[in-house]
């Protein structure tokens, strides 16, 4: 769904695709894991949240996270198909306030406490993938996604078709 | 406007494969997955799978794992699905058709080729 | 697998009669449904997406409701161009899977 041409094309347009409205289409509670079951845990140290991916010892509960469902103008001058192009974003909050942003300058994905409206960096763009894998496309920098890198969530820049599948941006939703 | 544009009905022997094609125009091919639908007589819809163009990505419906191969060709915006092994049971028309979201399936499908019918007989 | 139990199979009305079909999924797919329309002889057309939205240029007498497993399509004031197999389907999770279809004829 996101081929190179299709990541290249999108770059600046995807910048001025606008959300439809500022309420979610639907919310939900799921725990993040990785494609290889590791799980997504969010800790409070030194006020401020860190993001950690690790294995959960046995019967350890598992984080939760929010997820807001938007809907979103796909960039029509691009697709070619008017009005009909559109696209789901989500934002993931896993405490009251604080939302995972991408940090582009530092290929860093972080939690930050701000108020509604949220800013761009606080939107992906959800992709289903394998099974029934997500992925996490960064608004502001299609082409990036959301991606385990020496036990932490990074952005990863996906720039060959070789990588698009690759399982460090596959994650899982459970509801349980 | 958004069009897919399949290849045309075919008669095949119990045992022989078949590959059918999905053409599409009217939007950029490499940013919408393309799935297969398959309709037997009088019946209801079967999801068969579904591809990314853009990177060849698939996904497929375990009951069609070792029956349907897909494939696209992107220079030419096509999509194929083979079907091997032919039975009675494979005489259905093959659907393809466009998510209506860019990258998720969570809309369903937008977009409907005029469909293929196959039809397996000795 | 997700199951789409739809009911009833087959439906008997009059042309301006209101009429709905319903469809159950065997777990919570939230709002993540679809409705098609399909015509002897044609292709499925999508009608509503979203549980509740219309697709581009289907007629406002058609109406989705519904969210979590129970979902709800009623067609207000029956037409002709109307008679047609009805199918919800499911988008939560892969493999996407369809209702057997609701065949609505005209009494």
């Known amino acids: 769904a996101f081929g190179i041409s299709g990541v290249q094309k999108y770059t600046r347009a995807l910048h001025d695709s606008s959300i439809t409205g500022i309420s979610p289409i639907t919310e939900y509670l799921a725990s993040l894991s990785t494609y290889n079951d590791q799980s997504i845990t969010f800790a409070l140290e030194d006020e401020s949240y860190e993001i950690y991916v690790e294995d959960l010892k046995k019967d350890e509960k598992k984080d939760k996270v929010l997820l807001s469902y938007y809907e979103s103008q796909h960039p029509s001058n691009e697709s070619g198909d008017g009005v009909d192009g559109k696209m789901l974003m989500v934002t993931l909050s896993p405490t009251k306030d604080f939302w995972l942003h991408a940090n582009n300058k530092e290929h860093s994905v972080e939690l930050h406490k701000c108020e509604k409206p949220l800013p761009d960096q606080a939107f992906f763009v959800l992709h289903n993938m394998h099974s029934n894998c997500v992925s996490f496309e960064c608004k502001t920098d299609p082409g990036v996604f959301i991606g385990v890198k020496d036990n932490h969530l990074a952005l990863i820049k996906v720039d060959s078709s070789e990588n698009l599948c690759t399982e460090n941006i596959l994650f899982k939703l459970s509801e349980t | 406007q958004v069009q897919l544009q399949q290849s045309g009905n075919d008669l095949v022997k119990p045992g022989a494969s078949v590959k059918l094609s999905c053409k599409a125009s009217g939007y950029t091919f490499t940013s919408y997955w393309i799935n297969w639908i398959k309709q037997r007589p009088g019946q209801g819809l079967e999801w068969i799978g579904r591809?990314?163009?853009?990177?060849?990505?698939?996904s497929y419906n375990e009951l069609f794992k070792d029956k349907a191969t897909l494939t696209v060709d992107t220079s030419s915006s096509t999509a194929y699905i083979q079907l091997g092994s032919l039975s009675s049971e494979d005489s259905a028309v093959y659907f393809c058709a466009r998510e209506f979201y860019y990258g998720s399936f969570y809309g369903g499908f937008a977009y409907w080729g005029q469909g293929t019918l196959v039809t397996v007989s000795a | 697998d997700i199951q789409m139990n739809q009911s009833p199979s087959s439906l008997s009305a009059s042309l301006g009669d209101t009429i709905t079909i319903t469809c159950h999924a065997s777990?919570?797919?939230?709002?993540?449904l679809s409705w098609y329309q399909q015509k002897p002889g044609n292709i499925p057309k999508l009608l509503i997406y979203k549980a509740s939205t219309l697709h581009t240029g289907v007629p406002s007498r058609f109406n989705g409701s519904g969210s979590g497993t129970g979902f709800t399509l009623t067609i207000s004031s029956l037409q002709p161009e109307d008679i047609a197999t009805y199918y919800c389907?499911?988008?939560?999770?892969?493999?996407?899977?369809f209702g057997a279809g609701t065949k609505l004829e005209v009494k």
């Open positions: 389907q499911q988008g939560q999770s892969s493999p996407l899977t």
């Open positions: 591809i990314a163009p853009g990177s060849g990505f698939i």
């Open positions: 777990q919570n797919i939230h709002v993540w």
